[in-house]
Interface confidence: low
């Protein structure tokens, strides 16, 4: 979002006394930030602290296990995607504090706000890969026993990252800085050069590929998995399945406002009251989507505590227990293990 295609947040309320000696603005109240922006700043601050520390810890825990545990590969890649996105937060935070002034240059404008979209695509593609893995473990256990290996997992992750980069290119290409000096400031946003059709196309592609299609396919996927699990009387699903379902659900919950407002803004006339309202909520929607970047470590810790009964272990060992659990394939009465995942404790079903 944050486009000036011209669909910026209200960029006309920042007075940068350092760059130009303007006469006193009439509307002095506009020096204060709007409530949605203040909320966005609070969310950004929390997400940055939890996201950087949490994901760094997840990376540290899973990196050592990634050679031998496929689940660790999945969680490692998710954590890297989230960690990368969190690195942009201090810059985005600073920009909002300065009423959306962007003093960081054109390259930063193209790259940093695009990181959250890269995260969105990388996360959903990785989650789709993980979900396919869970699906195969349940419905094709013999195939998994023969072919499910770390090498294939890394290839799948590389494909997911490659596709994510490709899908982020439109946002990256249309991001530009624009100077405004009443009040003096540099704006960073998306410029579709008044081409509403192009803007709509980007918004639709983002909604379909980054939200609706994954929502549909993953819902079907997990419906089948859960039905099979329950039909086999495996009422206690493994930690990994519960954790993955929680991660998938949180993805859709936290991206929903961004996607809804994005598609609405692309179809609304920029002069309409609804559009102007949505514009003001833009930063808040972005910050809400950013919660995805810190929620996974929280899910892992909550899951770990749930499985441990109470938090007896250290945080790293608790995370290790959740993130590096071996996938034990159960089909009929036989238990078979992945040839790669050989060092795990036995846990029931899926």
């Amino acid at each position: 979002m944050d486009s000036f295609n011209y669909t910026t947040p209200d960029y006309g309320h920042y007075d940068d006394k350092d760059t130009l000696d303007l006469n006193t603005p009439v509307d002095k109240t506009s020096n204060t930030l709007r409530v949605p922006d203040i909320l966005a700043l609070v969310i950004f601050a929390v997400v940055f602290l939890v996201g950087v520390l949490g994901n760094a810890l997840v990376v540290w825990v899973t990196a050592f296990e990634a050679k031998r545990t496929i689940n660790a590969i999945w969680f490692l890649n998710l954590a890297v995607a989230d960690f990368l996105s969190c690195l942009a937060l201090p810059i985005l935070f600073t920009s909002i504090v300065q009423h959306h002034h962007w003093p960081f240059g054109g390259a930063a404008c193209s790259i940093l706000p695009s990181l959250i979209l890269l995260n969105m695509y990388a996360s959903i593609l990785l989650l789709a890969t993980i979900s396919a893995d869970r699906f195969l473990l349940v419905f094709k256990p013999i195939w998994c026993q023969n072919f499910r290996g770390a090498g294939l997992a890394w290839i799948a992750c590389a494909v997911a990252w490659g596709l994510a980069l490709l899908l982020t290119i439109p946002s990256f290409l249309y991001r530009v800085v624009r100077e405004e000096y009443f009040p003096p400031k540099v704006l960073c946003g998306v410029d579709y050069s008044h081409d509403k059709r192009r803007e709509r196309a980007v918004a639709i592609v983002r909604l379909v590929l980054g939200f609706l299609w994954p929502l549909l396919t993953l819902t079907i996927c997990y419906t089948f998995i859960l039905l099979r699990t329950w039909s086999r009387r495996a009422t206690r699903s493994t930690k990994t399945l519960k954790v993955v379902v929680a991660v998938v659900a949180s993805f859709f919950i936290f991206w929903l406002p961004y996607q809804v407002t994005g598609i609405m803004m692309s179809f609304l006339e920029p002069s309409s009251p609804t559009f102007l309202l949505l514009k003001k909520l833009d930063s808040l929607c972005v910050s809400f989507a950013y919660i995805n970047c810190c929620i996974n470590p929280i899910i892992y810790v909550v899951a770990g505590q749930g499985f441990q009964g109470r938090l007896r272990k250290s945080l790293p060992s608790l995370l290790r227990n959740v993130l590096t659990e071996e996938s034990v394939v159960r089909e009929s009465k036989s238990f078979t293990r992945s040839t790669v995942d050989t060092m795990a404790q036995k846990t029931q079903a899926v």
């Epitope: 011209y6 669909t7 006309g12 309320h13 130009l20 603005p25 000096y181 009443f182 009040p183 920029p270």
Partner: antibody, heavy 119, light 112 residues
């Protein structure tokens, strides 16, 4: 196509008031800083007022400060200039201009509306 | 305020001949970001002004390439390589570096 259509000019007595309007089309009005510029009978151009894209900030030269008020209605894509306590030296052709970034400041001009202050 | 001084006041040129207009500012127009916000406008008879050039030398879309802008600091020039009938009117320079915007007095281009 960017268009700025002006209305509201006319003859007014000294001390009187007048409101000029400028209807914008062909661009996203709410994203641009907008200005009023006047051209005196001697053909000199003079900046009169500027308003930020969201309408929060307004700027005036000392010659009109306290007498002129620039405003905008982004929902209606319209820019306004309320002129009060008019003086004879305010007699001019008034133009509304589009100005956002420095590079596109005053890149498009309205057709102009004549204001004559005379007793 | 920054004073913009244009010369000459009137310029009489034969069609097909070159023309040059000068604009001097009382202060440097180089902004802190390294850009110089000097624009040229043309006001044809009975019309509103139209911007021709921005950032000293960048031509607006639809402006013929016979127009060129140059200069830096406080001295700027607008050149027309071959004057055509449609070029007649009053040319104004305007600066946007310092608050407020200020305009030159104008140079009237006449056809001989």
């Amino acid at each position: 196509e960017v268009q700025l259509k002006q209305s509201g000019g006319g003859l007014v007595k000294p001390g009187g008031s007048l409101k000029l309007s400028c209807a914008a089309s062909g661009f996203t009005f709410s994203s641009y800083t907008m200005s009023w510029v006047r051209q005196t009978p001697e053909k000199r151009l003079e900046w009169v007022a500027t308003i930020s894209s969201g309408g929060s900030y307004t700027y005036y030269p000392d010659s009109v400060k306290g007498r002129f008020t620039i405003s905008r209605d982004n929902a209606k894509n319209t820019l306004y200039l309320q002129m009060s306590s008019l003086k004879s030296e305010d007699t001019a052709m008034y133009y509304c201009t589009r100005g956002g970034g420095n590079y596109d400041a005053m890149d498009y001009w309205g057709q102009g509306t004549s204001v004559t202050v005379s007793s | 305020d920054v004073v913009m001084t244009q010369s000459p006041l009137t310029l009489s040129v034969t069609i097909g001949q070159p023309a040059s207009i000068s604009c001097k500012s009382s202060q440097s127009l180089l902004y802190s970001n390294g850009k110089t916000y000097l624009n040229w406008l043309l006001q044809r008879p009975g019309q509103s002004p139209k911007r021709l050039i921005y950032l000293v030398s960048k031509l607006d879309s639809g402006v013929p390439d016979r127009f060129t802008g140059s200069g830096s600091g406080t001295d700027f020039t607008l050149k027309i390589s071959r004057v055509e009938a449609e070029d007649l009117g009053v040319y104004y320079c305007v600066q946007g570096t310092h608050f407020p915007h200020t305009f030159g007095g104008g140079t009237k281009l006449e056809i001989k």
